[in-house]
């Protein structure tokens, strides 16, 4: 059993959020993937998605968000460059699989962006800022709109929830059930 968790990233304005979402490559290698934000009391909002079918190692850029799907490795790389305070929020990767509901990938990212500058995450104090040049070959993909009433309509609690689930992805239909489970700190 695996656990539905949420990781808190505390970054400064101007820095880059650079994360990986791993998925079962046998199931989802070419499926369309998306990066979503979940605002309190709202439906998840898709900010960017890969092409359909998802192309291998082909960067897709939407504004300050760059997605790169590595099929061979079962990894989606998500970069949000030049972070702003208003980017703070809860994010998740999902896999689109119409006509079924999207699958959510672990782990969710709670991003907290504050004013002021410091080094990149995991770096020491005198590290230089991680500035990403936008790849020149990026393309923009159209993302499907999922407005099913069965998807999550409530943001999960702000602390990490330990919830067992048998696979590395869960169907969003189940999220409302999952978030009612007590939270263990």
């Amino acid at each position: 059993a695996t656990k539905l968790t949420e990781e808190k990233y505390e970054l400064k304005e101007g820095q880059t959020l650079d994360v990986k979402c791993d998925y079962t490559l046998e199931k989802f290698a070419s499926s369309q993937k998306a990066w979503q934000i979940i605002r309190d009391g709202e439906m998840p909002k898709t900010l960017a998605c890969t092409e359909r079918p998802s192309k291998n190692s082909h960067p897709v850029q939407v504004g300050r968000i760059i997605l790169e799907d590595y099929h061979d490795h079962g990894l989606l790389r998500v970069r949000m460059v030049n972070l702003q305070v208003e980017d703070s929020g809860l994010y998740q990767c999902v896999i689109y699989q119409p006509p079924k509901e999207p699958h959510m990938l672990f782990d969710r990212i709670r991003l907290v962006v504050t004013k002021g500058f410091s080094g990149t995450p995991g770096s020491n104090e005198n590290s230089t800022q991680n500035v990403y040049k936008i790849p020149p070959t990026t393309t923009k993909a159209l993302c499907p709109l999922y407005t099913s009433p069965r998807t999550v309509t409530q943001a999960p609690p702000k602390s990490t929830a330990d919830v067992s689930t048998p696979d590395s992805e869960i169907n969003l239909t189940n999220v409302t059930d999952i978030i009612r489970v007590p939270v263990f700190n």
């Epitope: 998925y23 190692s57 079962g74 990149t120 995991g122 770096s123």
Partner: antibody
Framework: QVQLVQSGAEVKKPGASVKVSCKAS????????INWVRQATGQGLEWMGW????????GYVKKFQGRVTMTRDTSISTAYMELSSLRSEDTAVYYC?????????????????WGRGTLVTVSS | DTQMTQSPSSLSASVGDRVTITCQAS??????LNWYQEKPGKAPKLLIY???NLETGVPSRFSGSGSGTDFTFTISSLQPEDIATYYC?????????FGGGTKVEIK
């Protein structure tokens, strides 16, 4: 102490398979991805792929796909790498390595803890 | 795949010398580069991560710099225990790839 202990040297014939084990101790096995890197005699380092011990998800470098399988047994904190259809050019030292990341999901590929390596010799 | 060209492939220097190794990526890898030290019969050891950050416990005579495609690894004052092969490793793109290594010897 924090360490990765690998299984002993193996001698295999071409076409056979080898399964190398990597036992973690001193840290929570399921909290860090395990990667496999090999080094042929007198050659450089070559990444083979990664595994998430928590969920069992894996990713393999294209040249090894179809021949490599990475698995784990969380009950004994052990990762395995099996390579099939062995050929002479697979003769190498195989290392397991822990991917350290400040955040579990961050795009950081630093290998801060390595096993001592397992020499696999493929010879007829 | 991103090719990592490391130079020189070997060098010989005196104790106390400043040693510089370069690594060039075939495409932009941002700051996503690490440096490792490998001694004969031992596993590689992480020295520098994310281009310029010194791993905990590593002597301050080791340093790294660079971004984009060109990176440099420096030993400010070579010590006898620094005899080893040094490798760069990029993670700006998958698959992860290593440089060919630089063997450092004492004159």
């Amino acid at each position: 102490q924090v360490q990765l202990v690998q299984s002993g040297a193996e001698v295999k014939k071409p076409g056979a398979s080898v399964k190398v084990s990597c036992k973690a101790s001193g840290y929570t096995f399921t909290s860090y991805d395990i990667n496999w890197v090999r080094q042929a005699t007198g050659q450089g380092l070559e990444w083979m792929g990664w595994m998430n011990p928590n969920r069992g998800n894996t990713g393999y470098v294209k040249k090894f796909q179809g021949r490599v399988t990475m698995t784990r047994d969380t009950s004994i904190s052990t990762a395995y790498m099996e390579l099939s259809s062995l050929r002479s050019e697979d003769t190498a030292v195989y290392y397991c390595a822990r991917r350290r990341a400040v955040y579990r999901s961050s795009w950081e590929w630093y290998f801060d803890l390595w096993g001592r390596g397992t020499l696999v010799t493929v010879s007829s | 795949d991103t090719q990592m060209t490391q130079s020189p492939s070997s060098l010989s220097a005196s104790v106390g010398d400043r040693v510089t190794i370069t690594c060039q990526a075939s495409q932009d890898i941002f700051n996503d580069l690490n440096w490792y030290q490998e001694k004969p019969g031992k596993a590689p050891k992480l020295l520098i991560y994310h281009a310029s950050n010194l791993e905990t416990g590593v002597p301050s005579r080791f340093s790294g710099s660079g971004s984009g495609t060109d990176f440099t690894f420096t030993i400010s004052s070579l010590q006898p225990e620094d005899i080893a092969t040094y490798y760069c490793q990029q993670y700006g793109n998958l698959p992860l790839t290593f440089g060919g290594g630089t063997k450092v010897e004492i004159k």
